[in-house]
């Protein structure tokens, strides 16, 4: 007996060929002896069936001995063993329909689950493989977890139904809805302005929802609220802002904030949190501030830097186009006594600078430039 | 398995240069920055610099400024280490190491099995 | 430049005895940024490259047997073998990273008495 798979919804083909290479009497009918459709002649007959409305054949094929049956818009229920009779022969198909289905809405909040049924006939026993954008492989039976989505999980998945040695594939489209970065880091001088920016991975035609960013200042003991905001229509609308700092927020996607001037003491850290209109959980995106400053009393040279930095990076002071004069695993650095000149400070990772700040040491007797 | 496969042993003239080669095999050499450190025999270790192949960036102790030159091949994997102006007392093993996470200025956690530089006239 | 002195010079000890290494540097590897100190501990034996033990003056390396530890803050730093086996006969150098340039100390021989 041939085994052909379906997949729910779609459209199969089950083939009945005649040894005689022209139209004769065929009939196709399940396993219950219900007669689904014929011919009289060139025309096309139907039986009793359910499947009355769905069922076809292609009279264009009749002339060569062949004679289909095409079943539309498959459902479970129509896998059956289908017989068809033709010379005094019987041809038997058995059909198995599958559909596979993600549990909820197929646009997922990162973090969450992603839950993949299948659906199929009884004394069927299919085995079930799928594979994720980013190339995971999982495996299952009737259903398939995954737990804690990730951006990377975004994309097709595509998924291999096996029964009988034949198989059937699946393709389902995911939609993790994230921020395109879980974590950035800002590094400012003191005094200058400051962008945050929270580009979405995805997109969306309509884009409503609510937001807020909190904020964790180093030298402060508890984490406060600087802003929270409306979306709606992909539209940013401010609903309340601190007076310090006074945060500005851009009124177009990808999100954006501006605090005008960094300071030591707005360096810390951020998460910035954002819950969609029917959508239970809220997405996520820490942002890091870290400031320096260089500054020069009496004959003591300082550079400090405040916020998250890690105990990896390098702090140093060092007189322009000369070594290094102090370089080392602190948040401050002093020189005493510093010779005339343009001094930097330099955080830096593996010898890339990520923040500098020049200040010039005059002659003993005047006072110093800031840059 | 990352491996630090260091090129041979070398002779040389006092004057002369040498160049040591270091290539990383079974892993991504642009995640990782390269220092050279020598020891004389029966001597201590002592850092020379070191190299990020990322930025390029370069940093020498101040003891080989103006005469060490470490370079980066990334099509190669392959980090060098030349030296100049060649003395007796440069007779050393010159060792590559690589910084443990990537991190520069750091502790090594993998090293090359050393390549011997002879210096005599 | 920070300056890394061991002692002793060379180390004689019983197998299954203690051996104790001390290193002082010049100046201090701890950051009070980061609370940690910037030390690094390493094995050498002849003909092979340094391998490390040892680091943040007192984590130890994967895979290395627990015998070694490594103990102090700030200047004074320690590397104990609780129990010296055959295989440990070597050379051990102290290592800074807190400040640049990475200096190493002169090292200390372990042979057994």
């Known amino acids: 007996k041939k085994v052909v798979l379906g997949k729910k919804g779609d459209t199969v083909e089950l083939t009945c060929t005649a040894s005689q290479k022209k139209s004769i009497q065929f009939h196709w009918k399940n396993s219950n002896q219900i007669k689904i459709l014929g011919n009289q002649g060139s025309f096309l007959t139907k039986g009793p069936s359910k499947l009355n409305d769905r069922a076809d054949s292609r009279r264009s094929l009749w002339d060569q001995g062949n004679f289909p049956l095409i079943i539309k818009n498959l459902k479970i229920e129509d896998s059956d063993t289908y017989i068809c009779e033709v010379e005094d022969q019987k041809e038997e198909v058995q059909l198995l329909v599958f559909g596979l289905t993600a549990n909820s809405d197929t646009h997922l909040l990162q973090g969450q689950s992603l839950t993949l049924t299948l659906e199929s006939p009884p004394g069927s026993s299919p085995s079930v493989q799928c594979r994720s954008p980013r190339g995971k492989n999982i495996q299952g039976g009737k259903t398939l977890s995954v737990s804690q989505l990730e951006l990377q999980d975004s994309g097709t998945w595509t998924c291999t139904v096996l029964q009988n040695q034949k198989k059937v594939e699946f393709k389902i489209d995911i939609v993790v809805l994230a921020f395109q970065k879980a974590s950035s880091i800002v590094y400012k001088k003191e005094g200058e302005q400051v962008e945050f920016s929270f580009p979405l991975a995805f997109t969306v035609e309509k884009l409503t929802g609510s937001g807020e960013l909190w904020w964790q200042a180093e030298r402060a003991s508890s984490s406060k609220s600087w802003i929270t905001f409306d979306l709606k229509n992909k539209e940013v609308s401010v609903k309340r802002v601190t007076q310090d700092p006074k945060l500005q927020m851009g009124k177009k996607l990808p999100l954006h904030l501006t605090l005008p001037q960094a300071l030591p003491q707005y360096a810390g850290s951020g998460n910035l949190t954002l819950a969609l209109e029917a959508k239970t959980g809220k997405l996520h995106q820490e942002v890091n501030l870290v400031v320096m400053r260089a500054t020069q009393l009496q004959k003591n040279l300082t550079c400090e830097v405040w916020g998250p930095t890690s105990p990896k990076l390098m702090l140093s002071l060092k007189l322009e186009n000369k070594e290094a004069k102090v370089s080392k695993r602190e948040k401050a650095v002093w020189v005493l006594n510093p010779e005339a000149g343009m001094w930097q400070c330099l955080l830096s990772d593996s010898g890339q600078v990520l923040l500098e700040s020049n200040i010039k040491v005059l002659p003993t007797w005047s006072t110093p430039v800031q840059p | 398995q990352v491996q630090l496969v260091q090129s041979g042993a070398e002779v040389k003239k006092p004057g002369s240069s040498v160049k040591v080669s270091c290539k990383a095999s079974?892993?991504?050499?642009?995640?990782?920055?390269i220092s050279w450190v020598r020891q004389a025999p029966g001597q201590g270790l002592e850092w020379m610099g070191w190299?990020?192949?990322?930025?390029?960036?370069?940093k020498y102790a101040q003891k080989f400024q103006g005469r060490v030159t470490i370079t980066a091949d990334e099509s190669t994997s392959t980090a060098y280490m030349e030296l100049s102006s060649l003395r007796s007392e440069d007779t050393a093993v010159y060792y590559c190491?690589?910084?443990?996470?990537?991190?520069?200025?750091?502790?090594?956690?993998?090293w090359g099995r050393g390549t011997l530089v002879t210096v005599s006239s | 430049d920070i300056v890394m002195t061991q002692s002793p010079d060379s180390l004689a000890v019983s197998l299954g005895e203690r051996a104790t290494i001390n290193c002082k540097s010049s100046?201090?590897?701890?950051?009070?940024?980061?609370?940690?100190?910037?030390l690094a501990w390493y094995q050498q034996k002849p003909g092979q490259p340094p391998k490390l033990l040892i680091y943040?003056?007192?984590t130890r390396e994967s895979g290395v047997p627990d015998r070694f530890s490594g103990s102090g803050s700030g200047t004074d730093f320690t590397l104990t073998i609780s129990s010296l086996q055959a295989e440990d006969v070597a050379v051990y150098y102290c290592?800074?990273?807190?400040?640049?340039?990475?200096?190493f100390g002169g090292g200390t021989k372990v042979e057994i008495k």
């Open positions: 079974g892993g991504t050499f642009s995640s990782y920055g």
């Open positions: 290592q800074q990273y807190y400040s640049t340039p990475l200096t």
């Open positions: 943040w003056a007192s």
């Open positions: 190491a690589r910084g443990e996470a990537g991190n520069l200025d750091w502790y090594f956690d993998l």
């Open positions: 100046q201090t590897v701890f950051s009070t940024s980061y609370n940690k100190n910037y």
């Open positions: 190299i990020n192949p990322n930025s390029g960036g370069t």
